[in-house]
Interface confidence: low
């Protein structure tokens, strides 16, 4: 059940990023650290960089509330997995500040790309029975 809960939360994050991409014009056009081509075993570290980034609503128009709620949900901690627990202790991963900074559109695209990667890794780790909840 923990596996499924993790999968549903990760899936929701993908959907939220997809939905926020439709509102990039309502986000503060600030440059944010956006990990790309993340090396294996540093996915959770990069994920936390995306979560820590100060993505903000520009406070314009009717979309402000839904954007703020969505950003909050992006920062919600997904259920822990063995892979996540293992990676939390890696000190060799790049710091958040070392990643290239990008505007919200590219930031969200890279976040989505990382989520997709983590998603597929999670599925394949289940298939090969190497991870439990």
């Amino acid at each position: 059940q923990g596996q499924d809960r993790h999968m549903i939360r990760m899936r929701q994050l993908i959907d939220i990023v997809d939905q926020l991409k439709n509102y990039v014009n309502d986000l503060v056009p600030e440059f944010l650290p956006a990990p790309e081509d993340v090396e294996t075993n540093c996915e959770w570290s990069a994920f936390s960089c995306f979560q820590k980034a100060q993505l903000k609503s520009a406070n314009t128009g009717n979309n402000e509330r839904i954007i703020n709620v969505s950003i909050k949900k992006l920062k919600r901690k997904p259920p822990s997995t063995n892979a996540g627990r293992r990676q939390k202790h890696r000190l060799t991963c790049p710091s958040c500040d070392s990643y290239e900074k990008k505007p919200p559109k590219e930031f969200l695209e890279r976040f989505k790309s990382l989520l997709d990667k983590m998603d597929h890794q999670h599925l394949s780790s289940r298939t090969h029975g190497s991870e439990d909840s």
Partner: antibody, heavy 120, light 107 residues
Framework: EVQLVESGGGLVKPGGSLRLSCAAS????????MNWVRQAPGKGLEWVSS????????HYADSVKGRFTISRDNAKNSLYLQMNSLRAEDTAVYYC?????????????WGQGTTVTVSS | AIQLTQSPSSLSASVGDRVTITCRAS??????LAWYQQKPGKAPKILIH???SLESGVPSRFSGSGSGTDFTLTISSLQPEDFATYYC?????????FGQGTKLEIK
């Protein structure tokens, strides 16, 4: 107006096939997970299958696994359910349903349903 | 699969009554639950998402509460249009499952 319109239901013999379609309008279809839910005559609701916005996750109820295939075409704002090896117990109204999105739990937009009858 | 058990299965009440329907999950589902209303010949309509959040456009007489395994849907003062069947649904794990339904009838 946010709308889902199902089509493709009908009468089919046991062992036969049908393809249900759902046309979405009034919202950004490519950003939402979609589901099929069915209801047999006089019975409760049964979740059948779900597919995420980019088709990354696909899940089925055990009762239809291996026989039904869910798919979507985001360019056409359409959701599909290919139903093979149909059985009498698949007789139901099939609803196309949008998952609420934005990280919320719920299904907030339902089509009017299309009726599938499996009978010899 | 997670089982949802609704009680009662049917209920007779009068306009103005306060009504409570419960939904019990076979395991912890956090707040991953929604409530729906369905009238004969119509598609279901969402009332509550995330166990306790009222869906936009739904009258405030409807409310949801609970977390973990025990959930309730409350209608504070029944209106004639509230006589229908109510379902809970969990989103904690696949397969998504529904409760068996509670039919609310006029006394």
């Amino acid at each position: 107006e946010v709308q889902l319109v199902e089509s493709g239901g009908g009468l089919v013999k046991p062992g036969g096939s049908l393809r249900l379609s759902c046309a979405a309008s009034g919202f950004i279809f490519s950003s939402y997970s979609m589901n099929w839910v069915r209801q047999a005559p006089g019975k409760g609701l049964e979740w059948v299958s779900s597919i995420t916005s980019g088709s990354y996750y696909i899940h089925y109820a055990d009762s239809v696994k291996g026989r039904f295939t869910i798919s979507r075409d985001n360019a056409k704002n359409s959701l599909y359910l290919q139903m093979n090896s149909l059985r009498a117990e698949d007789t139901a109204v099939y609803y196309c349903v949008r998952e609420r999105g934005w990280g919320y739990y719920g299904m907030d937009v339902w089509g009017q349903g299309t009726t599938v009858t499996v009978s010899s | 699969a997670i089982q949802l058990t609704q009680s009662p299965s049917s209920l007779s009440a009068s306009v103005g009554d306060r009504v409570t329907i419960t939904c019990r999950a076979s395991q912890d589902i956090d707040s991953a639950l929604a409530w729906y209303q369905q009238k004969p010949g119509k598609a279901p309509k969402i009332l509550i998402h995330d166990a306790s959040s009222l869906e936009s456009g739904v009258p405030s007489r409807f409310s949801g509460s609970g977390s973990g395994t025990d959930f309730t849907l409350t209608i504070s003062s029944l209106q004639p249009e509230d006589f229908a069947t109510y379902y809970c649904q969990q989103f904690n794990s696949y397969p998504y499952t529904f409760g068996q339904g509670t039919k609310l009838e006029i006394k």
